[in-house]
């Protein structure tokens, strides 16, 4: 088992990258002098206790920033949030911390990230640029749920 996070960069099919702005992740077109975030990801060590064939359950964080992506309900709506959290603290817990877990599925070069806590809800960006990352259950034209994940070695 790999027990250190892997690092990666993410962009969507419109070549927008993830940028941290006021503790919020937004997707913007790549430009010079821009600093896209580097993703830290690590597979859940309790994979056998999670659903099979849904993807690889992973914790997703921002490399070097002690921030992790999580899903929580605001009212009745699952929302995507950034929480101050060491990704290895999550990895080492005695049970999967589902609010911080995502099923990572790959099809060709495309990756999707489905919330483990809220099945059927995916990390997405609006088709319009400069918008925060969200969770959506509508896999259509309004939102992009397919991302390109490039691992950095």
């Amino acid at each position: 088992k790999i027990d250190t996070p892997q690092r990666g960069s993410i962009q969507d099919i419109n070549h927008r990258v993830w940028v941290l702005q006021d503790q919020t992740l937004i997707a913007v077109p790549r430009k010079d002098r821009m600093s896209p975030v580097t993703i830290a990801l690590i597979s859940c060590r309790h994979v056998e206790t999670l659903e099979k064939d849904r993807g690889n359950p992973i914790y997703l964080g921002l490399n070097g920033l002690n921030l992790c992506l999580m899903c929580a309900k605001v009212g009745d709506q699952p929302t995507l949030q950034l929480k101050e959290k060491d990704i290895m603290d999550l990895y080492n817990q005695p049970e999967p911390v589902k609010s911080f877990l995502f099923y990572h599925s790959q099809s060709g070069r495309n990756s999707t990230f489905e919330s483990v806590a809220f099945p059927g809800w995916f990390i997405a960006v609006s088709s319009e640029g400069g918008c925060p990352l969200i969770l959506t259950q509508e896999l259509g034209k309004a939102n992009t749920t397919d991302f390109g994940l490039t691992m950095l070695f």
């Epitope: 056998e48 206790t49 817990q93 005695p94 609010s99």
Partner: antibody, heavy 121, light 109 residues
Framework: QVQLVQSGAEVKKPGASVKVSCKAS????????IHWVRQAPGQGLEWIGR????????RYDPKFQGRATITTDTSTSTVYLEFSSLRSEDTAVYYC??????????????WGQGTLVTVSS | QAVVTQEPSLTVSPGGTVTLTCRSS?????????ANWVQQKPGQAFAGLIG???DRAPGVPARFSGSLLGGKAALTISGAQPEDEADYFC?????????FGGGTKLTVL
């Protein structure tokens, strides 16, 4: 408020099976893990196993693997422990407990009132 | 499989400080054992006190604190109250299962 309410006391003969229930209220059972623990007379606590009610996956102490079966009915927010091939040494109070993630860690925060299972010929 | 051992009984004076410990037969207890402490008062259900070695559960008074002490998990009650008279159990995590201790009966006298 959060509550775990267990079924009533049972008397069983050696070799029989028993099924104990634990009904949850005041929280969404799918957001936590439900564990079963037992306490024999004058003894400490003994962990039996747990279930993830959202998915149905289980873990068991190797000692109880094969004799204990934990299931859930999310429509009624109820978790069950079935214990088979009972012997006199299985006489104990059986407890369900919620293992809940809060802040930075998991806590065995809420427990059922216990179900006494007596195994006697 | 590890055996987890606690002091069978301890006594503390009201307002005094007492430390309960939790030892593992498999070696030193570490933060990777995610020590939990639960309390059972006479005639009441169990209630969680500590998780993750030193995190207090919501609503637990600050006089309860968890730590590691000499290779053991420890629960310290500072300024013990009469209502702290109870049985206390620790639980340690070992890779894929939990092991509970035999419990400590605490008398506040």
């Amino acid at each position: 408020q959060v509550q775990l309410v267990q079924s009533g006391a049972e008397v069983k003969k050696p070799g029989a099976s028993v099924k104990v229930s634990c009904k949850a209220s005041g929280f969404n059972i799918k957001d936590t893990y439900i564990h079963w623990v037992r306490q024999a007379p004058g003894q400490g606590l003994e962990w039996i196993g747990r279930i993830d009610p959202a998915i149905g996956t289980t873990r068991y102490d190797p000692k109880f693997q094969g004799r204990a079966t934990i299931t859930t009915d999310t429509s009624t927010s109820t978790v069950y422990l079935e214990f088979s091939s009972l012997r006199s040494e299985d006489t104990a109070v059986y407890y369900c407990a919620r293992l809940h993630y809060f802040g930075n860690n998991f806590f065995f925060d809420y427990w059922g009132q216990g179900t006494l299972v007596t195994v006697s010929s | 499989q590890a055996v987890v051992t606690q002091e069978p009984s301890l006594t503390v004076s009201p307002g005094g400080t007492v430390t309960l410990t939790c030892r593992s037969s498999s070696g030193a207890v570490t933060t990777s054992n995610y020590a939990n402490w639960v309390q059972q008062k006479p005639g009441q259900a169990f209630a969680g006190l500590i998780g993750g070695t030193n995190d207090r559960a919501p609503g637990v008074p600050a006089r309860f604190s968890g730590s590691l002490l000499g290779g053991k998990a420890a629960l310290t009650i500072s300024g013990a109250q009469p209502e702290d008279e109870a049985d206390y159990f620790c639980a340690l995590w070992f890779s894929n299962h939990w092991v509970f201790g035999g419990g400590t009966k605490l008398t506040v006298l």
